[in-house]
């Protein structure tokens, strides 16, 4: 088992909104949970966008999940990761 490296980034989406993206890379096996939470509550599927889990060329995998949020509310959102019995949460950088 190889644990993922998780990285959260932000980018401007439209006035007053930003897109936050949570990327996981370098993990094995492929099955990983990656999802956004607001105030600790899971966001619905229809408010998140997922990338496919893809091989990264090193025998490991990568994927991502993104969602659009209001600027200034970043502290309310966390990215949750579960992989091979381990879990972690990752805040949005300010």
């Amino acid at each position: 088992t190889v644990p993922p490296m998780v990285n959260v980034t932000r980018s401007e989406a439209s006035e007053g909104n930003i897109t936050v993206t949570c990327r996981a890379s370098g993990f094995y096996p492929w099955n990983i949970t990656l999802s956004w939470r607001q105030d600790g509550v899971s966001l619905s599927h229809d408010t998140q966008q997922w990338g496919d889990v893809l091989p990264d060329g090193n025998g490991t995998y990568q994927t991502w999940v993104a969602t659009r949020i209001c600027q200034g509310e970043e502290q309310r959102f966390t990215c949750y990761m579960e992989h091979s019995g381990n879990h972690s949460t990752h805040p949005v950088p300010s």
């Epitope: 990983i32 949970t33 600790g40 997922w50 496919d52 019995g85 879990h87």
Partner: antibody
Framework: QVQLKESGPGLVAPSQSLSITCTVS????????VNWVRQPPGKGLEWLGM???????DYNSALKSRLSISKDNSKSQIFLKMNSLQTDDTARYYC??????????????WGAGTTVTVSS | DIQMTQTTSSLSASLGDRVTISCSAS??????LNWYQQKPDGTVKLLIY???SLHSGVPSRFSGSGSGTDYSLTISNLEPEDIATYYC?????????FGGGTKVEIK
């Protein structure tokens, strides 16, 4: 192999609380979500809520005020507690492991269920 | 909450028949749909996830399709062990919600 088994009181008096335990084997609770689903007699399935690997919970908002889900990772057990039971809470209660892989989000293994009757 | 409707509550078919079970959502669910089988003894099993992906160990006679608000489960060649109630379930929005079920019986 992956297994889940529910155990409950069978009979609960109206206005009392319900406690059900789901004991799992074949996987770790620290890296898997577990859901609770119920089915009243002759009716369909209703999702109650779930607990994630880190202990975070999500609830059906219609029942959130009466529900509590917790777990003991070391004993591989998940607990459902529901308060203020009424006769329409009579149902078979299931626990089910969740699989959450990007666009794919499903309950891949279910327990056999435990029947709870609310009656005086 | 999203309402899931299975208009046919029960159907009778002969062994070997092709059986199609329909499910509609009260709004678009972007293929976020699963199918479960519940045997008469209450045992529940996952059949299909994400509209059309066959769960491991499920016979290939089961298939799923659909988009938007309308989805279906097909059993291509009905076997005796397929006697059960089938439920669709959406996960586009929380809470996940199930259809009312379609009971399949042998003629």
């Amino acid at each position: 192999q992956v297994q889940l088994k529910e155990s409950g009181p069978g009979l609960v008096a109206p206005s009392q609380s319900l406690s059900i335990t789901c004991t799992v084997s074949g996987f770790s609770l620290t890296g898997s979500g577990v859901n609770w689903v119920r089915q009243p007699p002759g009716k369909g399935l209703e999702w109650l809520g779930m607990i994630w690997g880190d202990g975070n919970t999500d609830y059906n908002s219609a029942l959130k005020s009466r529900l509590s889900i917790s777990k003991d990772n070391s004993k591989s057990q998940i607990f459902l507690k529901m308060n203020s039971l009424q006769t329409d809470d009579t149902a078979r209660y299931y626990c089910a492991r969740g699989a959450y892989y990007g666009k794919r989000w499903y309950f891949d293994v279910w327990g056999a269920g435990t029947t709870v009757t609310v009656s005086s | 909450d999203i309402q899931m409707t299975q208009t046919t509550s029960s159907l009778s078919a002969s062994l070997g028949d092709r059986v199609t079970i329909s499910c509609s959502a009260s709004q678009g669910i972007s293929n976020y749909l699963n199918w479960y089988q519940q045997k008469p003894d209450g045992t529940v099993k996952l059949l299909i996830y994400y509209t059309s992906s066959l769960h491991s160990g499920v016979p290939s006679r089961f298939s799923g399709s659909g988009s938007g608000t309308d989805y279906s489960l097909t059993i291509s060649n009905l076997e005796p062990e397929d006697i059960a109630t089938y439920y669709c379930q959406q996960y586009s929005k929380l809470p996940p919600t199930f259809g009312g079920g379609t009971k399949v019986e042998i003629k």
